[in-house]
Structures are given as C-alpha cells and as structure tokens.
C-alpha cells in the first residue's frame, strides 16, 4: 500500500479579520494509526493551533467529524481571524507511539494572509493657536491594517494638499501596519470655517475611503482690527466714543477702556456678530463728561484676545479749545489714533 | 479589582428551574480568550464541572447534564447566567462561577472563582 | 471522560515537613493540560499550579508540582499552617473537564 500523503490542497488563503479562515487537510490514507495535529510556523517554536487528541481550542472547529473510523478529512475551520492569526498553517499526521506519539508527516502548509481594514483615521492639529500667515502641521494617524499597501490624501476644503510626509510602521513583516502622516497647513484670515480631511484608502475598504476631519476652527486665532471713533453729541458736555472690535475669532475677547492711562472700565464680549467668515465684530462704547478734564484727555481702548497681549487703539479729545456754548460735536477734535502693544 | 459575584434563589423546589447569575467586574466578558464556567460541589463533596462559554459564544457542557443547561451571556450587564432544569435532590450544591482564560496551543484553566452560593433543592 | 483519582483521601502531617499529593489520570495526558487548585476551609477553590508544574501568582514557592502521563504529583515543600485546605487537580485535556475527588491535608 502506498505510503500516506499529508495533502494540503490551498498553498495561500485570504481571510478578511472578522471572518472564519477554512484551512484544508486530507490525508491519502488511514495508515498508520494517529492523530492530526494543526501547527502555525515550524521548527521547535511552532505554535500548536488544533489537536485532534488533546486539548481545548475554542477557536477551531473541524470540517468533519474527526471521531469516525474511515475520516481522511482533517480540515479545520478557525473563527474571528485578526492579523495575529497570519502565518504558514501546517497539517502533521502523527503515528501513534508509546509514550508520546511520533511525528510522522506534515503537509507543504499553507500561508494564512488577513486582511484587516484600517481604523478610522485621528487627525490632530498643534497644541497651540495660530494666527494668518503661520504654517501649522496637522497629524493623521490609522492603525491595524493588513496588507501593508495604502494611499493617504490630504485636503484642505476639498483642495488636494501636497506638503506632507508619511510613514507606514513598521518597515518589515508584520501582522498589521499604522500609518502616520503630518500635513502642513498655511492659515488665511477666512480660515474659520475650514477643514482639514486626511483621506485612506486601502484594499480593504473597497474603494470607500475612510476619512478624519479636524476643524480649522480649533487651530486659528484671528486677532482683531480696532478702530475708535468720536459720536456726536448725545449731551451738554458729553462726547460718546466707540471702539469697534473687528473680524475676530475665537470670540474670548476683553475690552478695558483708558482714560489718561486710568482704567475707566473693562467688559467682556458677549454679544457679538458674527461674519459670513465666521469671525466676529464687537462694540464698545463710553460716555466721555467733557466739563470734568481741564486738560486734553487720552482715549484708549485696550484688547486682550485669547490670551494674547493687549493691542490697543488711542483717541485724543481736546477740551481746551472748546467754550461752553458750543455744540458738544465741536467739542472734541480727533487727533488721529496711535496703535500699540501694551505689555 | 476582578471579581465575581453569584446570585440567585438559594432554595428550589425539585423538578423546578435553578437559575443564577455571575455578576463580574474588573474584566469584560467579551474580552478575547476569555470564557465563564460554572463548576459545582455537592456539600462536602468534590468539584464538578457543569459547563463553560467562550468569548465567541462558544459552549462547551458536561454530557452528563447537557441536555438539562444552559448557560448564557449578558455583555452589556457582564453578567452571565446559568439555567438548570427538572432539578432534583442530587443538584443541591454550592455552584461557583468562575473565569476561564485560554492561554492558546490547547491550554486553558479556571484563573478566578466566585464565592459560590449554596441553592438547596427541597420542597 | 478522564478519571482523576487523587491519593491520599487525607494526609495529616506536622508543620515544617513535606507533604506529597498524587493524580493519576485513566488516559495519558499531556502535562500542559494537568492543573491543581487549592481550597480553604468555607472558600472557593482558587488556582494553584498551572500545565503540571507553573505557580501561579501570589503562590508561594514551597508549593512545586511535576508528572507527566498518567502520573502527577503536587509537592508543598515546609508545610505552614495556613496550607490546611483540599487539593483538587483538574484536567483540560479533554472535554468533560474533570476534577479529582481531591485530598485533604490537615495540620497535626
């Protein structure tokens, strides 16, 4: 009788993480006595995957049923496949010895690959806030995915971005692969309401590509354009001024008004505009009781936006020029402004 | 901190349904490669195993009391529930809930166990 | 299904010396499938050994276990009072899962 053959028809199987991976086995005949064994890998440091004798294996169960006397059939089925589970897979009939059963023949194995898709990508912008003009780097990260192949686009409001760089780890073989990729982004004054996509595409997603989004929203700060100005008289010897805070965002903004270097008031924005940009416009406004200043009085009003250090926007008054029986609007003349940055 | 907690009705009146559950926390019950068994001990007797399910909803029972179990998962409780029908005399025991780890190449043995809780069968 | 017959019913020995508990098992059994639990007077049994001969945690080093085929043995080197309990071992060699009828060491 000829000598048994250890057939393991399929050389490489595709599985699709989640899904149940069938690996085939038969043998060419029932001689000698003993059982199968399934193992991943070879040599000593072989992983045991199904014994047909001994053991619990709550992933794997057999084609057929392995208890029947004339069974050649040592398919095995294994379910919830991860990238871990990839590998060469080989079937080894074993002889029946004493005390321990012998090693008798392995099938040619076969190559278990899985595809796995890769998690929806996390993009993240910088810790800190940044103003038009600057270059921020946005990150996007995806993990777990197998084979190693993938493409990565990055769009800033649907506009293709080319200034980035990407790395899929690691470099070798490996279960499943994360990539990695940093965009750099340059900010406009219109930038509020715009996003940044990172887009991939891998064979798994069936040409549906996963997407992450960040919000420009979270990265810019736009500060705001100030401007102070003198209203007509809204009583004898009063002069209302106004300070108009201008195309601002993010909306945390506090406003202190100066007379002469002396705070008169502070508040914060609270009711604002806001513009089809997405920043905001703001008012203030004080109520300035000429008769009070001998002197020339220095209108100041001073910004703090975000946290960042105070701009400020000055109005000069003169009261000297000014007699009583004129009209409150020719009471004050503006002198011109002068911006600064108060530290 | 892992642990497993039984509860249930600890008196049953024969040929009536035992029901318990294994209230567990510090782990999930869907965590890969991990099961919940039900082993039992008569009063001072040994230990009999009455059956386990894995992760993947697989369950393996003692023929012996196979066609009378059922043993099932709550994840969203991480509860799991043991049912044991037409009981007699015989099935009085304290029945402890335990954890099962599969540690892969075939093995795989009872890593935590209940206090276990005594259910008398008497009418 | 497996038979675990586990030897002595009792073993009653003084503190300080070796206890010696035996399994022996119908079928041959691989060693990686021979577990032993331990059980405390009014406690659940509680994992002691592992795949014939590896502790496990929190398990004193006095406590070694060693066999293979049929024949298992756990060992508890310097007996200390606190070792009073029954010693069962387990199979998972094949399904039933079976436990011995155990043994039950007692402190002179």
């Known amino acids: 009788e000829e000598e048994l053959q250890v057939i393991q028809p399929d050389k490489s199987v595709l599985v699709a993480a989640g899904e149940t991976a069938t690996l085939r086995c038969t043998a060419t005949s029932l001689i000698p006595v003993g059982p199968i064994q399934w193992f991943r890998g070879a040599g000593p440091g072989r992983e045991l995957i199904y014994n047909q004798k001994e053991g619990h294996f709550p992933r794997v169960t057999t084609v057929s049923d392995l208890t029947k006397r004339n069974n050649m059939d040592f398919s095995i089925r294994i379910g919830n496949i991860t990238p871990a589970d990839a590998g060469t897979y080989y079937c080894v009939k074993f002889r029946k010895g004493s005390p321990d059963d012998v090693e008798f023949k392995s099938g040619a194995g076969t190559e278990l690959s899985v595809r796995a898709k890769p998690s929806a990508p996390v993009v993240s912008g910088p810790a800190a806030r940044a103003t038009p003009q600057h270059t921020v780097s946005f990150t996007c990260e995806s993990h777990g995915f197998s084979p190693r192949d993938i493409t990565l686009k990055w769009f800033k409001n649907g506009n293709e971005l080319s200034d980035f760089q990407t790395n899929v780890d690691p470099v070798g073989e490996s279960v499943s692969y994360s990539i990695h990729s940093t965009a750099k982004v340059v900010l406009t004054r219109e930038d509020v309401h715009s996003q940044v996509i990172c887009e991939v595409a891998h064979v798994t997603l069936q040409g549906d590509p996963l997407r992450g989004t960040a919000n420009l929203s979270e990265t810019i700060r736009v500060p705001p354009t100030l401007e102070v100005t003198q209203q007509p008289v809204r009583a004898e010897n009063q002069v209302n001024v106004t300070c108009q805070v201008r195309k601002f965002y993010p909306q945390r903004l506090q406003l202190t008004w100066l007379e002469n270097g002396n705070v008169s008031r502070t508040e914060t924005a609270s009711t604002v505009t806001e513009n089809k940009d997405g920043t905001y416009n703001w008012m203030s406004w004080l109520l300035v009781n000429v008769s009070a200043h001998r002197d020339d009085v220095k209108l100041t009003c001073q910004v703090e936006h975000d946290g960042q250090p105070a701009v400020s926007k000055s109005h000069d008054l003169k009261v000297s020029a000014h007699p009583k029986e004129q009209g409150s609007n020719t009471a004050a003349e503006n002198t011109g402004s002068n911006e600064r940055n108060i530290y | 901190q892992l642990q497993l907690q039984e509860s249930g009705p600890g008196l049953v009146k024969p040929s009536e349904t035992l029901s318990l559950t294994c209230t567990v926390s510090?782990?999930?019950?869907?965590?890969?490669?991990?099961?919940m068994g039900w082993i039992r001990q008569p009063p001072g007797k040994g230990l009999e195993w009455i059956g386990h399910?894995?992760?993947?909803?697989?369950?393996y029972y003692n023929s012996a009391l196979q066609s009378r179990v059922t043993i099932s998962v709550d994840t969203s409780k991480n509860q799991f529930s043991l049912k044991l029908s037409s009981v007699t005399a015989a099935d009085t025991a304290v029945y402890y809930c335990?954890?099962?780890?599969?540690f892969g190449s075939g093995q795989a043995w009872f890593t935590y166990w209940g206090q276990g809780t005594l259910v008398t069968v008497s009418s | 299904e497996i038979v675990l017959t586990q030897s002595p019913g009792t073993l009653s020995l003084s503190p300080g010396e070796r206890a010696t508990l035996s399994c022996s098992s119908s079928?041959?059994?691989?060693?990686?499938?021979l577990h032993w639990y331990q059980q405390k007077p009014g406690q659940a049994p509680r994992l002691l050994i592992s795949?014939?001969?590896n502790l496990a945690s929190g398990i004193p080093d006095r406590f070694s276990g060693s066999g293979s085929g049929t024949d298992y043995t756990l060992t508890i080197s310097r007996l200390e009072p606190e070792d009073v309990a029954v010693y069962y071992c387990?199979?998972?060699?094949?399904?039933?899962?079976?436990f011995g009828q155990g043994t039950k060491l007692e402190i002179k």
């Open positions: 795949g014939t001969s």
């Open positions: 510090g782990f999930s019950l869907n965590t890969y490669d991990i099961g």
């Open positions: 399910i894995w992760w993947n909803d697989r369950e």
């Open positions: 335990a954890r099962i780890d599969y």
């Open positions: 079928s041959t059994i691989s060693s990686t499938y």
């Open positions: 387990q199979q998972g060699s094949r399904i039933p899962f079976t």
